[in-house]
């Protein structure tokens, strides 16, 4: 999906209002400095591409983030403010339901959510401190 035509201001507002709080709750008891940055993004559409990938694509060491509250809200926000996004996600959602499994929060999932927080921080920072 190409995130170029999303309403970035509305997504930022949703993130600050709800998604950020859910991410921080998930990370409770963990310092952001516990994990090094292993993923970055270079503009707002790129940030959303990487956020979608980390949130919804299961990895061998962390398979279950898509069912978390922050992931549900992320999905709803993208569907609301990115034209045509929800249609592209139907097949992916059906495939995910088939492999649904209850999870335990592993250190690798905490690391992945720490990376997500970093990506969202870059997304809401429209400019570097200086040019």
């Amino acid at each position: 999906y190409d995130f170029t035509n999303c309403d970035f201001q509305k997504i930022e507002a949703d993130y600050l209002r709800t998604i950020s709080k859910d991410l921080i709750t998930y990370m409770s008891g963990t310092k952001s400095t516990d994990f090094n940055n292993t993923v970055s993004c270079s503009n707002r559409p790129h940030c959303l591409t990487e956020i979608q990938s980390l949130t919804f694509n299961p990895t061998p060491r962390c398979a279950s983030l898509a069912k978390e509250m922050f992931a549900r809200k992320t999905k709803a926000t993208l569907a609301l403010w990115c034209p045509g996004y929800s249609e592209t996600q139907i097949n992916a959602t059906q495939a995910m339901k088939k492999r649904r499994k209850r999870k335990v929060t592993t250190n690798k999932c905490l690391e992945q959510v720490s990376q997500l927080l970093g990506l969202w921080r870059r997304f809401i920072r429209t400019l570097l401190k200086k040019q």
Partner: antibody, heavy 122, light 109 residues
Framework: QMQLVESGGGVVQPGRSLRLSCAAS????????MHWVRQAPGKGLEWVAV????????HYADSVKGRFTITRDNSKNTLNLQMNSLRAEDTAVYYC???????????????WGQGTMVTVSS | SYVLTQPPSVSVAPGQTARITCGGN??????VHWYQQKPGQAPVLVVY???DRPSWIPERFSGSNSGNTATLTISRGEAGDEADYYC???????????FGGGTKLTVLG
């Protein structure tokens, strides 16, 4: 852990070519800008080139423009530097380094490789 | 093109504060990064965006930037701080990375 490993250095005659490679691991390579920086024996750091996270744009130092080409293969997590028409003054340790980028701005180089030595001599 | 000027050498007594400067035209409008390089090793980022510090760097390292001078400050200097230090900026107007010439820090004694 996050790592960059350079290879391909060696001794080469003036006017010849050499290709350096940098293998990345431990991070999502496709999301970072990547640089080559060199250091001549006993001298300071000299920036050589940078390639955007997606390979779409490149920038070069004037001293290597037209002779060196920086490329990346995000499917293989590798960075390359093709060096043509080599000169004695290109003798240096060559480092690859990653940096986050925001739009056209490159940020600090937070991870560096250990370097590979290139000697241009007849 | 943009030029960054550093003193070739700075000395500090153990336990004292070292300040390494990096001069450039209106450098305060740019983000400055600092690297430490020990002999035979690759550079290591110690301060980025003027004054931020990577999580693995001790609090003794700090930075500031205004006007025409950026400064790296190393408090309570230790023998292990002996190294070359380089400032660096991204020059947006020319799309080039610029490094300072480097400063050799010597810890006396």
């Amino acid at each position: 852990q996050m790592q960059l490993v350079e290879s391909g250095g060696g001794v080469v005659q003036p006017g010849r070519s050499l290709r350096l490679s940098c293998a990345a691991s431990g991070f999502t390579f496709r999301t970072y800008g990547m640089h080559w920086v060199r250091q001549a024996p006993g001298k300071g750091l000299e920036w050589v080139a940078v390639v955007w996270y997606d390979g779409s744009y490149t920038h070069y130092a004037d001293s290597v423009k037209g002779r060196f080409t920086i490329t990346r293969d995000n499917s293989k997590n590798t960075l390359n530097l093709q060096m043509n028409s080599l000169r004695a003054e290109d003798t240096a340790v060559y480092y690859c380094a990653r940096s986050p980028q925001w739009e056209e701005i490159f940020e600090a180089m937070d991870i560096w490789g250990q370097g590979t030595m290139v000697t241009v001599s007849s | 093109s943009y030029v960054l000027t550093q003193p070739p050498s700075v000395s500090v007594a153990p336990g004292q504060t070292a300040r390494i400067t990096c001069g450039g035209n209106n450098i305060g409008s740019k983000s400055v990064h600092w690297y430490q390089q020990k002999p035979g090793q690759a550079p290591v980022l110690v301060v980025y965006d003027d004054s931020d510090r990577p999580s693995w760097i001790p609090e003794r390292f700090s930075g500031s930037n205004s006007g025409n001078t950026a400064t790296l400050t190393i408090s309570r200097g230790e023998a292990g701080d002996e190294a070359d230090y380089y400032c660096q900026i991204w020059d947006s107007s020319s799309s080039l990375v610029v490094f300072g010439g480097g400063t050799k820090l010597t810890v006396l004694g």
